[in-house]
């Protein structure tokens, strides 16, 4: 957020940029949380996303029986490992086709026991407030599909007639990790020392990180003719003085007519 300054007073302004603002020769360049000519004002809303997509990672182990383990498979840069990776990836792409959240697989380790394949199944979905349910459902379908294929594609008389065959009992799901998106936490962090006063409100399923100084939300503070300003002690109304009135009170809702006050003073004297 920037405010441009013209004229002789600019040099003074330069040394007075507040709250970590930096002078660029024309204006104070303010950090995310501040704005104003001197970066003296606290913003009333902070952009917290959300991210476009949310990811999940399932740690799985399957046992491939149609390939015999060789030492070369331990080396991830060997031709053998690369070929195994290619075939395994193709096989898993077939297994998980039909799962829109499926992105791919990543082999982490191959070890002896026919070939025990430790790998991650990667899932991704567009962010909606229901992303957890979407990814939970996808992980269940992954479990169903891998269980089915490792039960059906098995060796018969030491020969496999499929791209890969598996040991039915060698399939395990070790761990499921979903990227956590917590708008409340993000809001609190980004608001820094003002974190106690910023809240998340939703509009059209999108989270907004706002202080009570942001108008149009249920938490918005009504300062009437005054101006809402954030300080370390919370939002406060700065009341205005017009030609005819002084305003006061917590929400600047108490107006005192100047003429009455002056009239009273004249009467006093």
């Amino acid at each position: 957020r920037t405010t441009t300054c013209f004229g002789d007073g600019c040099q003074n302004t330069a040394s007075r940029c507040k709250n970590g603002g930096t002078w660029d020769g024309l204006k104070c360049q303010c950090p995310n949380l501040y704005y104003g000519e001197l970066c003296e004002e606290v913003v009333s809303s902070i952009d917290i996303g959300p991210p476009e997509t949310i990811s999940a990672q399932m740690e799985l182990t399957v046992t491939v029986t149609s390939v015999k383990f060789t030492e070369e498979l331990k080396n991830h840069s060997s031709q053998e490992f690369q070929e195994f990776k290619q075939t395994f990836t193709e096989q898993m792409n077939i297994v998980y086709s039909g799962i829109p959240e499926y992105v791919g697989v990543n082999i982490t380790k191959l070890r002896l026991g026919s070939v025990v394949v430790e790998h991650d199944v990667l899932l991704r979905t567009k962010y909606t407030p229901e992303y957890k349910t979407v990814l939970d459902n996808a992980t269940e379908v992954v479990k169903e599909k891998i269980t089915k294929v490792t039960t059906q594609q098995i060796m018969i008389n030491d020969i496999c007639s499929d791209m890969m065959c598996f040991n039915t009992t060698g399939t395990q799901v070790q761990n499921i990790t979903v990227t956590q998106y917590d708008p409340e936490e993000d809001c609190r962090k980004m608001a820094k020392e003002y974190g106690d006063y910023f809240v998340v409100e939703y509009r059209d399923q999108k989270p907004y990180c706002i202080s009570p100084c942001e108008p149009g939300f249920s938490v918005s503070k009504n300062c009437n003719l005054g101006k809402c300003q954030m300080s370390l002690s919370g939002p406060q109304c700065l009341c205005v003085t017009t030609e005819t009135h002084w305003y006061s009170g917590e929400t600047c809702n108490q107006g005192t007519q100047k003429s009455l006050v002056y009239g009273h003073h004249h009467h006093h004297h």
């Epitope: 029986t65 149609s66 390939v67 015999k68 070369e72 053998e80 075939t87 030491d158 020969i159 007639s161």
Partner: nanobody, 123 residues
């Protein structure tokens, strides 16, 4: 880069014999799996036989006792000796290879392929 070149096909009478060869270049001859597949007109490609680096062999039921697969690691070559040929053996024969020790007759498991050689069994 692995390259496979199949040869030895031709026209033969029922009951006759043929020997197919496959020359492999860029393939580590003492490792992996080499195989023969065939595709008859209008049919899917099917596994005929494969041989592993340790000499372990496997055959399709339809060719057991008639066909013999072998490999010469020194020459980086694969062979298929076909005896007692039948009309139903008529097909294009392909050699295939994998760097892995495979136990599968599924074509999708083999990344390296030679061009086919035609075998016709007819009187």
């Amino acid at each position: 880069d692995v390259q496979l070149q199949a040869s030895g096909g031709g026209l033969v009478q029922p009951g006759g014999s043929l020997r197919l060869s496959c020359a492999a270049s860029g393939f580590p001859s003492s490792r992996g799996t080499m195989a023969w597949f065939r595709q008859a007109p209008g049919k899917e490609r099917e596994g005929v036989a494969f041989i592993n680096s340790d000499g372990r062999t496997s055959y399709a039921e339809s060719v057991k006792g008639r066909f013999t697969i072998s490999r010469d690691n020194a020459l980086s070559s694969l062979y298929l000796q076909m005896n007692s040929l039948r009309a139903e053996d008529t097909a294009v024969y392909y050699c295939a290879a994998s760097l892995l020790y495979l136990m599968t007759v599924n074509a999708a498991a083999y990344p390296y392929w030679g061009q086919g050689t035609m075998v016709t069994v007819s009187s």
